[in-house]
Interface confidence: low
Amino acid sequence: GIAIPRNSGCPNSEDKNFPRTVMVNLNIHNRNTSTNPKRSSDYYNRSTSPWNLHRNEDPERYPSVIWEAKCRHLGCVKADGNVDYHMNSVPIQQEILVLRREPRHCPNSFRLEKILVSVGCTCVTPIVHHVA
Amino acid sequence: GIAIPRNSGCPNSEDKNFPRTVMVNLNIHNRNTSTNPKRSSDYYNRSTSPWNLHRNEDPERYPSVIWEAKCRHLGCVKADGNVDYHMNSVPIQQEILVLRREPRHCPNSFRLEKILVSVGCTCVTPIVHHVA
């Protein structure tokens, strides 16, 4: 990895497992200052591979609410509104970081956790396996 | 928010800003134990709204490398391989949590940050504004 030059004004850590356990300020800084007109807003409805958003809630996790996309169809929607089953609607998935309370129910102690979430759906050409 | 019952075995916090500053164990627990066959692997190439993945690197951030999707075309790819400009390829975006070193260069002190990333692209019917 890249060597990080140590800043003399850093908080000290007496944790034996340092740097595995770190201090994190939960006052979230949001870098998305400008409202992006391309934000996924209504794409879930206008897409040729439309999806529904399901709420996933877990009080032991931070953030506690995550929205999960589920593709509406196996195929893709054509211009006439019918579904084309020669194409496939598939979920676009991404690994994201969340904080998991550890030990459970502790308000100030977390472990970093990676989870896989479906963000939306896209229409793909299926992989056809020809039998010899 | 939801009240979290306090566990008597929790680490103590003498931080005046508690619970804004918390301890986080960076030993990542990966909940994606099974290899998911639907993982977005080659969808970026097979999609009717294909995308390229650009590496975004920042040593002051955790994770330091994030892959950003950029749609290849303004339109969507038809079955014959040509691009249909009556449809639009648009990025599916998601807000994700990252850790930002704060103060800068400190190895054990972070602030939680929300950033907007493009995960992939989907093909949508454009919104047409008719001029009266």
Partner: antibody, heavy 124, light 111 residues
Framework: EVQLLESGGGVVQPGRSLRLSCAAS????????MHWVRQAPGKGLEWVAV????????YYADSVKGRFTISRDNSKNTLYLEMNSLRPEDTAVYYC?????????????????WGQGTTVTVSS | QSGLTQPPSASGTPGQTVSISCSGS????????VNWYQQVPGAAPKLLMY???QRPSGVPDRFSVSQSGTSASLAISGLQSEDEADYYC???????????FGSGTKVTVLG
């Protein structure tokens, strides 16, 4: 008319430095990624470097990494290639080229506008 | 060492179809769309095709491309004398972290 005009080439001794410039006109320079591509005498095209529209991202060919620096001045509509520790194998015609789509694209839309090239000769 | 391999030469008589192959790997053609360039002697290269078979304005539809797996090809139908040039395929390569050109193919129009 969209145009790219390279300058700064010449004859230089091995180990010395040279700075190439590429003046852009006829398009909004600050919206487009830009490349440098070179062609040694009688040889094929070799990609050198690319810079994003805002200068935040730069990528280099292994053969020039650590020796060449690509940069841009959007206020002057100019692309640069700073070449240090020059070697005889750097002898070539150097072209600057514009990415075919505005925004954060590096190659998908191809390199749609090319300059006429400037010749760099590294020889003792 | 180019990441993309092309035949050094190809030829045909006027009116014929000539195909040029471009072979790569998963990190380049297998992951990205291929661009094609034409370079006539003494001139700068010119973009011929990009994306999935898209032509810049002014490029005749005699030029067509295909791409599958880790290879791509350019076909020139109804070959004309002005098509005599060097042709290069190019794309992004993830493992190199950069743009890569093919070795180039010289097309000769016979007769």
């Amino acid at each position: 008319e969209v145009q790219l005009l390279e300058s700064g080439g010449g004859v230089v001794q091995p180990g010395r430095s040279l700075r190439l410039s590429c003046a852009a006109s006829g398009f909004i320079f600050s919206n487009y990624g830009m490349h440098w591509v070179r062609q040694a005498p009688g040889k094929g095209l070799e990609w050198v470097a690319v810079i994003s529209y805002d200068g935040s991202n730069k990528y280099y060919a292994d053969s020039v990494k650590g020796r060449f620096t690509i940069s841009r001045d959007n206020s002057k509509n100019t692309l640069y290639l700073e070449m240090n520790s020059l070697r005889p194998e750097d002898t070539a015609v150097y072209y600057c080229a514009k990415v075919g789509a505005s925004g954060d694209y590096y190659y998908s839309y191809g390199l749609d506008v090319w300059g006429q090239g400037t010749t760099v000769t590294v020889s003792s | 060492q180019s990441g993309l391999t092309q035949p050094p030469s190809a030829s045909g008589t006027p009116g014929q179809t000539v195909s040029i192959s471009c072979s790569g790997s998963n990190s380049n053609i297998g992951s990205h769309s291929v661009n094609w360039y034409q370079q006539v002697p003494g001139a700068a290269p010119k973009l011929l095709m990009y994306g999935i078979g898209q032509r810049p304005s002014g490029v005749p539809d005699r030029f067509s491309v295909s791409q599958s797996g880790t290879s791509a090809s350019l076909a020139i139908s109804g070959l004309q004398s002005e098509d005599e040039a060097d042709y290069y395929c190019a794309t992004w390569d993830d493992s190199l972290g950069g743009y890569v050109f093919g070795s180039g193919t010289k097309v000769t129009v016979l007769g």
